[in-house]
């Protein structure tokens, strides 16, 4: 959301969320690291071109035009600096002067040595336990947000993992028209169009970045879960790694598991959609899982096929019109799952990235509060993993995204919420080994054993 | 100026347990990230692990995990390393030091002058 | 875990000589590598830290160097304050090793 110096009635005001990086003449004298030549305090540019017409409610959203709601200046970075005051460098460099590039390899988590599975499990449950050092989130939309009194800003402090289930619930919530009116569901920053792998991707990159920072460990990377195994189990669920089910009660982790201690955030939808609230930093129920267990619908009790990425991997065009989830012959909805994985829509068939969540059968297959299930990450860098393989192969072809008439938050250029400092989807529309300094050592059915690079 | 002062040299019995303590100045210890090192006799450095005081975390190397165990109090600008279960294989001087991770600089800047341990019946 | 290897373990030059220490990583360190001189009985000291910048205070005639897995330190024009142990460290991922040290004695 925003960074904690933006979170105050002043800045709120001007509009203008410029930290300093370094003030060693008081506040104010270092805007985006401006004196050391860092970047500078401009104007944001944020996509103005139409959407499509599912969304009839322009100006009742705060998520709008991205984030001019909020801030109409932020920091620009020069060269490889970036951050929200140009005090860290772009993903893939570091160094004082952040020229110096690195690589990072996302690995089957089922591949990692004892301690490397036991080292990523407590690095996720720091994360689920550390105050994010540089954000905080709203508890108000934007007319409520200086509070009762107009004098006292609603934000919190959040977890970094919480955060990354904050940003989530945050672009998948309804509209509030206002009280005593329904709120309007048919919106979504961040699935159902274009802009699903660029969002999802971004999201996982600054998990994995915070936690870096978290552990002082560069090398840090988010595992893989291969879902695509055609099986009715879950091998990741076993208390090394995810955890294994409760004896007591089938729809919990193991108590041998530390996830089992975990409580979930954005649980109360009904609250926020009567009241016009945000989902808070508050803590509520524990994760449900119950992984093949949804005996009324027998088509979401077996994971993806290894096949079905592969036909997916077919698919050649980015996406179509109507840039939606009945799109047809678009990789997008193929790997999203709401097409078969040939590519064909069909209304009644949920694949791949979709059927994984929702053979979870539990939190992790309810879109506003999926991520609180840390299968969530691994599951969803699988999904960018086949992504990167589609970037690669078809030589990162973004002239079938739209420049507009997508759904909204999901043009080519549109600021994909709520991350910030502001990014478009077109920023993670690229490899990831040449652009973004991580890549996948992943084996596609029918290939050799890579290092995607 | 920025010092580390650690506390002073223990004998204790094997099977017994240490705390050590290294206070801090010229420095909010809530910005930086506290290391210690295990040097023993004649020998090399060995990473042990760190501590964030700000908010408590810790990683230590796996070798140390379970013996090792790192605390600070933020009020007096100091830090703890306690250790358990100790053998004469623990006979070493600790070093406490920090690492500034503002811009990922790679180094443990300020050390401690070291706190001998005597592991012995 | 990254390994460090050092070499060598020990060396023994004259006053303004020059001497190199090398380090190599199991893997791939991106430069994240810093090198400490121990005086005997002393802490150790910084000398170069991201692989190749000098720390405040620390004489131009050391420099550091590499990249990748390979890393080396260079003293040139030995002084008698030189002599010590030197130790590289890398900070890429946990846990953050040590080489195991260089006796370099001034003969």
């Known amino acids: 959301q925003f960074p904690r110096e933006c979170a105050n009635i002043e800045a709120l005001r001007r509009g203008v969320c410029c930290p300093d990086l370094l003030p060693s003449s008081g506040p104010g004298t270092d805007p985006c690291g401006s004196s050391s030549g860092r970047g500078r305090c401009v104007a944001v540019i944020a996509d103005s071109r139409p959407h499509s017409r599912h969304y009839p409610h322009d100006g009742k959203d705060d998520r709008e035009a991205w984030p001019l709601r909020f801030f109409n200046r932020t920091c620009q970075c020069n060269d490889n600096f970036s951050g929200h005051n140009c005090g860290t460098c772009r993903p893939g460099w570091r160094g004082a002067a952040c020229n110096q590039k690195i690589l990072t390899v996302r690995r089957n988590l089922l591949d990692l040595s004892p301690e490397e599975k036991s080292h990523f499990v407590r690095a996720l449950d720091m994360a689920k336990r550390t105050t994010h050092p540089q954000f905080v989130i709203a508890t108000r939309r934007l007319e409520d947000i200086l509070g009762p009194d107009g004098n006292t800003p609603q934000f919190e402090n959040i977890s970094v993992y919480n955060y990354f289930v904050w940003t989530h619930y945050y672009s998948v919530k309804k509209t509030f028209l206002g009280t005593g009116q329904e709120s309007f569901g048919d919106v979504d920053f961040s699935h159902e169009g274009p802009a699903f792998l660029t969002w999802h991707r971004y999201h996982l990159l600054q998990l994995e970045r915070d936690m870096q920072e978290m552990l002082q460990e560069p090398s840090f990377s988010l595992p893989y879960w291969n879902f695509a195994t055609g099986k009715n189990v879950c091998d990741v669920c076993t208390d090394d790694l995810m955890g294994s089910r409760s004896n007591f009660d089938s729809t919990l982790i193991s108590p041998n598991s530390v996830f089992s201690q975990w409580r979930v955030v954005c649980e109360s939808l009904e609250e926020y959609d009567t009241l016009g609230t945000l989902c808070n930093s508050t803590e509520g129920g524990p994760i449900r899982r119950n992984p093949a267990g949804n005996v009324g619908r027998p088509a979401v009790q077996r994971l993806p096929e290894p096949q079905d990425v592969t036909q997916c991997l077919e698919v050649r065009v980015f996406d179509t019109p109507p840039f939606y989830s009945n799109s047809t012959d678009s990789f997008r909805n193929t790997v999203e799952g709401y097409s078969a994985p040939t590519g064909k829509y069909d209304p009644a068939v949920r694949s791949l990235h979709n059927l994984a969540h929702l053979f979870l059968n539990g939190t992790g297959g309810q879109t506003h509060l999926s991520p609180n299930d840390p299968i969530f990450v691994l599951l969803h860098t699988f999904t960018d993993a086949v992504f990167d393989e589609w970037l690669r192969r078809y030589n990162a072809d973004i002239s079938t995204f739209p420049l507009e008439n997508a759904p909204i938050g999901h043009n080519r250029q549109y600021n994909m919420v709520p991350f910030w400092p502001p990014v478009t989807n077109t920023e993670m529309f690229v490899t990831a080994p040449d652009n973004l300094g991580y890549a996948y050592e992943v084996q596609w059915p029918g290939q050799e054993f890579t290092v995607s690079e | 100026e920025v010092q580390l002062q650690q506390s002073g040299a223990e004998l204790v019995r094997p099977g017994a347990l240490v705390k050590l303590s290294c206070k801090t100045s010229g420095f909010n210890i809530k910005d930086y990230f506290l290391h210690w090192v295990r040097q023993r006799p004649d020998q090399g450095l060995e990473w042990i692990g760190w501590i964030n005081p700000d908010n408590g975390n810790t990683v230590y190397d796996p070798k140390f995990q379970g013996t090792a165990s790192l605390t600070a109090d933020t009020s007096s600008n100091t830090v703890y390393l306690q250790l358990s279960g100790l053998t004469s294989e623990d006979t070493a001087v600790y070093f406490c030091?920090?690492?500034?991770?503002?811009?990922?600089?790679?180094?443990?800047?300020?050390w401690g002058q070291g706190a001998s341990v005597i592991v012995s019946s | 875990d990254i390994q460090m290897s050092q070499s060598p373990a020990s060396l023994s030059a004259s006053v303004g000589e020059t001497v190199t220490i090398t380090c190599r990583a199991s893997?791939?360190?991106?430069?994240?590598l810093a090198w400490y001189q121990q005086k005997q009985g002393k802490s150790p000291h910084l000398l170069v830290y991201?692989?190749?910048t000098l720390a405040d205070g620390v004489p131009s005639r050391f420099s550091g160097s590499g990249s990748g897995t390979q890393y080396s330190l260079k003293i040139s024009s030995l002084q008698t304050e030189d002599s010590g142990n030197y130790y590289c460290q890398h900070f890429w991922s946990l846990p953050f090793t040590f080489g195991s040290g260089t006796k370099l004695e001034i003969k």
């Open positions: 991201d692989a190749k």
């Open positions: 893997g791939n360190i991106y430069n994240y």
């Open positions: 030091t920090r690492r500034d991770y503002t811009y990922e600089k790679a180094a443990l800047d300020y």
